[in-house]
């Protein structure tokens, strides 16, 4: 798998969407997972609806929320009020049985707020209260690693 | 149009190996469907025993997934079930299907093929 | 495992009659249901899919309905031709078929 890289201001919030084959995986709950290193496990974040047709309502872990077009074929991640501590490594994972299909391996990469908050004066900063549906979720910006880059830069 | 053709002997003997193929025509395995195989017992209904995927993916039925394999061969526009420890009660009538899901159900079958387990 | 409950299990109509064969899931399953007949002797073939839809080449007096758990099969006029076994069949997890009803002509 590619590595796609989404892009998103700290303080919105950043959509991240896998596409997969909705044949393939019918019939199968979703996951979306943070990789603890370039060998490590992938950390359950959250996951669809424990009934799979009910994977449209959307899920909730903190502020990260995950819904899935079953039929369309698209699991949608919303990553609310993104702070730095966001970026890094996650997958979009397919659930069969014990194991986990990779459906996209994600880079979320946190990009500083042109706009300083604390001299913003009147400007409207989502609470914590907002409910997801209520969330401006402002466009990635996604692109796909190129070929000889390394996703997990040796650390020194 | 897709047509299925099943294949394979038409006795087994118990506690061994029973082995079927589907030969797939008029249209791709690699195409957007699952592989299925559907058994009947003499006088009975129908059992799903499972399903593949071109990529090889399989999805099983729970009471008999310890003794099924179902394999694909894309080069041959095939897929293949076996099924071990057979005994009397595996004795039916064996159905390969496509499964197309929403998308149009189990739309197309074999004619079917008589296994009889015995000795 | 979703269990699919069927009734009757066997019926006898006659040439021109409405008959209905109704399909119960064990959980709900949407419209993810499908309908087979099968003759004697030969493989089933599918009549209506995801409930509601009458797959390629079947005679309009075949329709089917019903969403969650509970679906009706409908043969508006029955014909000689329609003697067979018919089937539900639910595909929101490991499919399964319903136990059958048996359609004989008085």
């Known amino acids: 798998h590619n590595t796609t890289v989404f892009q998103g201001v700290e303080g919105q919030s950043l959509q991240v969407s896998c596409p997969y084959d909705s044949m393939k995986h019918w019939g199968r709950r979703k996951a979306w997972c943070r990789q603890l290193g370039e060998k490590g496990p992938c950390q359950r974040v959250v996951s669809t609806h424990n009934l799979w047709l009910l994977s449209f309502l959307r899920r909730r872990n903190g502020s990260t929320a995950i819904t899935d077009d079953t039929l369309g074929g698209t699991l949608t991640i919303t990553l609310r009020n993104l702070q730095p501590h966001d970026a890094g490594f996650y997958q979009c994972q397919s659930l069969h049985g014990s194991e986990a299909d990779t459906l996209r391996k994600v880079l979320v990469e946190v990009l500083a707020d042109p706009l300083d908050h604390r001299d913003a004066g009147d400007l409207w900063v989502p609470g914590e209260s907002e409910s997801f549906e209520d969330a401006h979720v402002e466009h990635s910006i996604s692109r796909s690693l190129l070929e000889g880059e390394i996703p997990f830069p040796p650390t020194s | 149009q897709v047509q299925l053709q099943e294949s394979g002997p038409g006795l087994v003997k118990p506690s061994g190996t029973l082995s079927l193929t589907c030969a797939v025509s008029?249209?791709?395995?690699?195409?957007?469907?699952?592989w299925s195989w559907v058994r009947q017992p003499p006088g009975k209904g129908l059992e799903w025993i499972g399903e593949i995927y071109h990529d090889a993916d399989t999805n099983y039925n729970p009471s008999l997934k310890s003794r099924v394999t179902i394999s694909v061969d894309k080069s041959k526009n095939q897929f293949s079930l076996k099924l071990s420890s057979v005994t009397a009660a595996d004795t039916a009538v064996y159905y390969c299907?496509?499964?197309?899901?929403?998308?149009?159900?189990?739309?197309?079958w074999g004619q079917g093929t008589t296994v009889t387990v015995s000795s | 495992d979703i269990q699919m409950t069927q009734s009757p299990s066997s019926l006898s109509a006659s040439v021109g009659d409405r008959v209905t064969i109704t399909c119960q899931a064990s959980?709900?399953?949407?419209?993810?249901l499908n309908w087979y007949q099968q003759k004697p002797g030969k493989a089933p073939k599918l009549l209506i899919y995801d409930a509601s839809n009458l797959a390629t080449g079947v005679p309009s007096r075949f329709s089917g309905s019903g969403s969650g758990t509970d679906f009706t099969f409908t043969i508006s006029s029955l014909q000689p031709e329609d003697i067979a076994t018919y089937y539900c069949q639910q595909y929101v997890e490991a499919p399964t078929f319903g136990g059958g009803t048996k359609v004989e002509i008085k």
């Open positions: 299907a496509r499964d197309t899901k929403y998308w149009g159900g189990m739309d197309v």
């Open positions: 959980q709900d399953i949407s419209n993810y």
């Open positions: 008029g249209g791709s395995i690699s195409d957007s469907a699952w």
